[in-house]
């Protein structure tokens, strides 16, 4: 019964490094926030740099899946 909605303007700073913020709407639980990170970043709030080697690997996998 939960679904994702884009964060309100005032909530966007939950994520850093250009990460896109989403709120998990769930009637039975308090609101939670999730971040969709920009390429090169990871972590709950997009705070961590992804090593270049891993980035290239991800790109290769992405191309392979296409």
């Amino acid at each position: 019964t939960s679904h994702l909605v884009k964060c309100a303007e005032k909530e966007k700073t939950f994520c850093v490094n250009g990460g896109e913020c989403f709120m998990v709407k769930d009637l039975s639980n308090p609101s939670r926030y999730l971040c969709k990170c920009q390429p090169g970043f990871t972590g709950a709030r997009c705070t961590e740099n992804v090593p270049m080697k891993v980035q290239n690997q991800e790109k290769a996998e992405e191309l392979y899946q296409k």
Epitope: E9, K12, T13, F14, R32, G43, A44, R45
Partner: antibody, heavy 116, light 107 residues
Framework: EVQLVESGGGLVQPGGSLRLSCAAS????????IHWVRQAPGKGLEWVAA????????NYADSVKGRFTISADTSKNTAYLQMNSLRAEDTAVYYC?????????WGQGTLVTVSS | DIQMTQSPSSLSASVGDRVTITCRAS??????VAWYQQKPGKAPKLLIY???FLYSGVPSRFSGSGSGTDFTLTISSLQPEDFATYYC?????????FGQGTKVEIK
């Protein structure tokens, strides 16, 4: 009521070590983001380090990288700042703060003095 | 690192005055800017987050505006308790960085 209480500050010689603690209460510790910010006497605010207890990810200012380590114990609702190889320029009041959409709650601060 | 440059570094004003403090980021930080008030010997207090949103419990005489690189904190009618130092801070990228502060003094 949200509360952050820092402890562990004091006088230490250059090259020495200290461990600061930030005891948190009144909120879900594992769901927050904890930051350490410092303020040298008569100076402005400087961001030092941060930890996301949920996934353990950490970040550091270049000025402390390799010398300071931030950690968190979710069972004790406490964050720590282990400070090694201390220098005179690390002398400051150290604050811990929680971050939701900004640094919304701050502790009272603990003074660290590095001097011989 | 993103530099946050505040101006002025200090100002003198009277009770009832309208006060404006500006903050310029060295690169685009969207609306990821917060403003804090600090009094001597005390921890900073959050006033404004996400550039323009008033934090809970903060008087409505405080307001924030801006996006991209230019931001403003305005106190519409200065009160005796508002004499303090104000800091802007960007949280668009790590490391987070603060402005150097603006001290608001009594004229």
């Amino acid at each position: 009521e949200v509360q952050l209480v820092e402890s562990g500050g004091g006088l230490v010689q250059p090259g020495g070590s200290l461990r600061l603690s930030c005891a948190a209460s009144g909120f879900t510790f594992s769901g927050t983001w904890i930051h350490w910010v410092r303020q040298a006497p008569g100076k402005g605010l400087e961001w030092v380090a941060a930890i996301t207890p949920a996934d353990g990810s950490t970040n550091y200012a270049d000025s402390v990288k390799g010398r300071f380590t931030i950690s968190a114990d979710t069972s004790k609702n406490t964050a720590y700042l282990q400070m090694n190889s201390l220098r005179a320029e690390d002398t400051a009041v150290y604050y811990c703060a929680t971050y939701m959409f900004a640094m919304d709650y701050w502790g009272q601060g603990t003074l660290v003095t590095v001097s011989s | 690192d993103i530099q946050m440059t505040q101006s002025p570094s200090s100002l003198s004003a009277s009770v009832g005055d309208r006060v404006t403090i500006t903050c310029r980021a060295s690169q685009d930080v969207s609306t990821a800017v917060a403003w804090y008030q600090q009094k001597p010997g005390k921890a900073p207090k959050l006033l404004i987050y996400s550039a323009s949103f008033l934090y809970s419990g903060v008087p409505s005489r405080f307001s924030g505006s801006g996006s991209g690189t230019d931001f403003t904190l305005t106190i519409s009618s200065l009160q005796p308790e508002d004499f303090a130092t104000y800091y802007c801070q960007q949280s668009y990228t790590i490391p987070m960085t603060f402005g150097q502060g603006t001290k608001v003094e009594i004229k």
